[in-house]
């Protein structure tokens, strides 16, 4: 058999600074099994070095000196007896860039440098970023383990140092943030914030970092109801809104959460399976009615829980007045005034702009009030005839406004015809 020296190794390999690379390699050399069996030694040298004197970059020969700058970083991987010359390069440095050749030695007969198959190593600037691993989604209040690792890095070389930064880490002690792993208990306010892992090789200038935006899943913590862009005050899960009867109303309910909660509006205080009157955070009423005193509920439904706020509508109305109207009856002149308002209004009668309060001590007039449904009625009885033309007014008022009406009573009962007083409003 013809003696053959062969080496199979890639011509060039590129690795980023601080990372590792494995260069597969196999070789063959002439060897007869009936020869004596001296040990097989293999070496990797820097190109241009003289094998007899030079320090090697990697070898399996314990008696050969290894270059201090590659010690522990360049290693032979695999079984050389099986003709495996694979080279592992760790914590690559810029100064490692260059050509390397492989040499085999066994006894006196086998001493060969494979100069035709050199390995060209190029170390480039580090652009690889670390990976931050954690189980998604992050859930508010649930501790989660995060780890930071650099693809392509290995144990070779000085140890890596880590530092974590981000708003979500504020309560952690500094030691915790210097490990490749940390346990984070995210809060709702951490959603959307940045978390950065920075890696550095001790004693080297090589640093790299990765920033991730935290996606924290959290149930709604609060509900806000807006009217015309203004938030309503909420006390004990209830909001109070005074609103004018007959007015159109558009309300917006907002409940920050992630993923967004499903918002809906219900009549009154609903059961859990009630039918919504709006399947969004928007409630539109073409007008508010007195019947709306029952109020509405905004519910925010979320996979992590639900929240609801009751909106208590306090419906108010300005006094609406019917009257006064007057007629002659047996006991004297009888005037009536009807009014409707929320809250219930006060009412007073005036005769020639002079207030008539209660019942007169002389018995010249009498006031009676009653209410039925939304309407209240008041009556004024004036005893005796009219000495001159008189103006009778009634006025209703509440905290939101007032309304008044008046009639002009013309002198002389005979003028009144069918008994209805001619009115000049």
């Amino acid at each position: 058999e013809k003696p053959v020296y062969e080496l199979q190794v890639q011509k060039s390999v590129t690795v980023q600074e601080g990372l590792c690379v494995l260069v597969p390699c196999s070789f063959s050399y002439p060897w007869r099994s009936w020869y004596s069996s001296p040990p097989l030694y293999v070496y990797w040298f820097r190109d241009g070095e003289i094998p007899y004197y030079a320090e090697v970059v990697a070898t399996n020969n314990p008696d050969r000196r290894v270059k201090p700058e590659t010690q522990g970083r360049f290693r032979l991987l695999g079984d050389v007896q099986k003709k495996n010359c694979s080279l592992s390069i760790g914590d690559a440095r810029m100064e490692d860039t260059g050509s390397y050749f492989f040499r085999v030695e066994r006894g006196r007969d086998v001493k060969y440098s494979y100069q035709q198959n050199k390995l060209n190593l190029e170390v480039t600037a580090l652009i690889e970023k670390p990976d931050i691993h954690f189980l998604e989604p992050l859930e508010s209040g649930r501790p989660t383990r995060l780890s930071c690792s650099l693809p392509g890095s290995c144990e070779a070389g000085p140890p890596l140092t880590f530092s974590w930064t981000g708003n979500a880490l504020s309560p952690l002690d500094p030691e915790t943030t210097r490990s490749s792993e940390l346990t984070l208990t995210p809060r709702p306010e951490d959603h959307g914030t940045n978390l950065t892992c920075q890696m550095k090789r001790q004693g080297a200038q090589v640093t790299t970092e990765r920033t991730v935006q935290l996606n924290v899943s959290y149930a709604p913590q609060t509900i806000t109801i807006f009217r015309n862009g203004i938030a309503l005050e909420i006390l004990q899960n209830t909001s109070y809104l005074p609103v004018l009867e007959g007015q159109a109303l558009r309300l917006l309910c907002d409940a920050p959460s992630n993923p967004p909660a499903h918002l809906s509006w219900f009549q009154g205080s609903p059961a859990l399976n009630a039918t919504p009157i709006s399947n969004t955070g928007i409630l539109e009423l073409r007008r508010v009615r007195s019947a709306e005193e029952g109020g509405f509920t905004c519910r925010a439904q979320h996979p992590l829980g639900f929240l609801q706020i009751f909106l208590n509508l306090s419906v108010y109305s300005l006094p609406q007045l019917l009257g006064p109207s007057c007629s002659w009856e047996a006991e004297g002149l009888h005037c009536r005034c009807s009014f409707r308002a929320r809250p219930a209004p006060s009412l007073c009668w005036r005769l020639e702009e002079k207030p008539l309060e209660g019942n007169s001590s002389q018995g010249s007039f009498k006031v009676n009030s009653s209410s039925a449904g939304p309407w209240a009625n008041s009556s004024l009885i004036l005893h005796g005839g009219l000495s001159s033309d008189l103006k009778v007014s009634c006025k209703a008022w509440n905290i939101y406004g007032s309304q008044s009406g008046s009639v002009l009573l013309l002198q002389g009962r005979s003028n009144l015809g069918t008994g209805v007083v001619p009115a000049a409003l």
């Epitope: 509006w265 009157i277 709006s278 399947n279 539109e284 009423l285 073409r286 009615r289 019947a291």
Partner: antibody, heavy 122, light 113 residues
Framework: QAYLQQSGPELVKPGASVKVSCKAS????????IYWVKQSHGKSLEWIGY????????NYNQRFKDKATLTVDKSSSTAFMQLNSLTSEDSAVYYC???????????????WGQGTLVTVSA | DIVMTQSPSSLAASVGEKVTMSCKSS????????????LAWYQQKPGQSPKLLIF???TRESGVPDRFTGSGSGTDFTLTISSVKAEDLAVYYC?????????FGSGTRWEIK
């Protein structure tokens, strides 16, 4: 419980007018729109229009704009529909109906009157 | 105007059977502001006024038996009677109240087989 009571059947001559009434009870009359619907014999339903007793607002189906006039009398909680220039095509059952919740300008018909049969015949 | 197309125009089924009827609208009845579907179903028994069964496409009116179910969204809707009873003999109408003029389907008549 809301209840709508309509006036009785009418037999009218072509060219004449008729006024159908619908008396509401069991709820606050001004809080809900009253709708009117036509159903010709053996046919489907046709929306005529609505009257809003709160503010007097109306909305008509264009097909009935010149045929129907909607009014109400708030004091008696009664809605009216007057049909004019009647022809045989107007022979039908006419229903009044009340909307559901009264929140929206567009709602379903939750309560129906019993219907008034108007027959136009010479 | 929105056109409401109901099918079939009539169907025959035995008491106890499941009955399904369809209603298609010529445009979507989903109102984006409140994400509610503006469709109702009515039942009209012979000689009677229509009666509300379903509103907002799937909300059963109070007092309506739970054998009546409304479903669908957008433009395609279905009324299902899970186990039809003799008293359900009627014409069923779908109704869009999404935009004026309000319109009704031509009806589906259920007859006993």
């Amino acid at each position: 419980q809301a209840y709508l009571q309509q006036s009785g059947p009418e037999l009218v001559k072509p060219g004449a007018s008729v006024k159908v009434s619908c008396k509401a009870s069991g709820y606050s009359f001004t809080d809900y729109n009253i709708y009117w619907v036509k159903q010709s014999h053996g046919k489907s339903l046709e929306w005529i229009g609505y009257f809003d007793p709160y503010n007097g607002g109306t909305n008509y189906n264009q097909r009935f704009k010149d045929k129907a006039t909607l009014t109400v009398d708030k004091s008696s909680s009664t809605a009216f529909m007057q049909l004019n220039s009647l022809t045989s095509e107007d022979s039908a059952v006419y229903y009044c109906a009340r909307e559901g919740y009264g929140y929206d300008d567009r709602e379903w018909f939750a309560y129906w009157g019993q219907g008034t049969l108007v027959t136009v015949s010479a | 105007d929105i056109v409401m197309t109901q099918s079939p125009s009539s169907l025959a089924a035995s008491v106890g059977e499941k009955v399904t009827m369809s209603c298609k609208s010529s445009q979507s009845l989903l109102y984006s502001t409140n994400q509610m579907t503006y469709l109702a179903w009515y039942q009209q028994k012979p000689g009677q006024s229509p009666k509300l069964l379903i509103f907002w496409a799937s909300t059963r009116e109070s007092g309506v038996p739970d054998r009546f179910t409304g479903s669908g969204s957008g433009t395609d809707f279905t009324l299902t009677i899970s186990s039809v009873k003799a008293e359900d003999l009627a014409v069923y109408y779908c109704h869009q109240f999404y935009s004026y003029p309000f319109t009704f389907g031509s009806g589906t008549r259920w007859e006993i087989k």
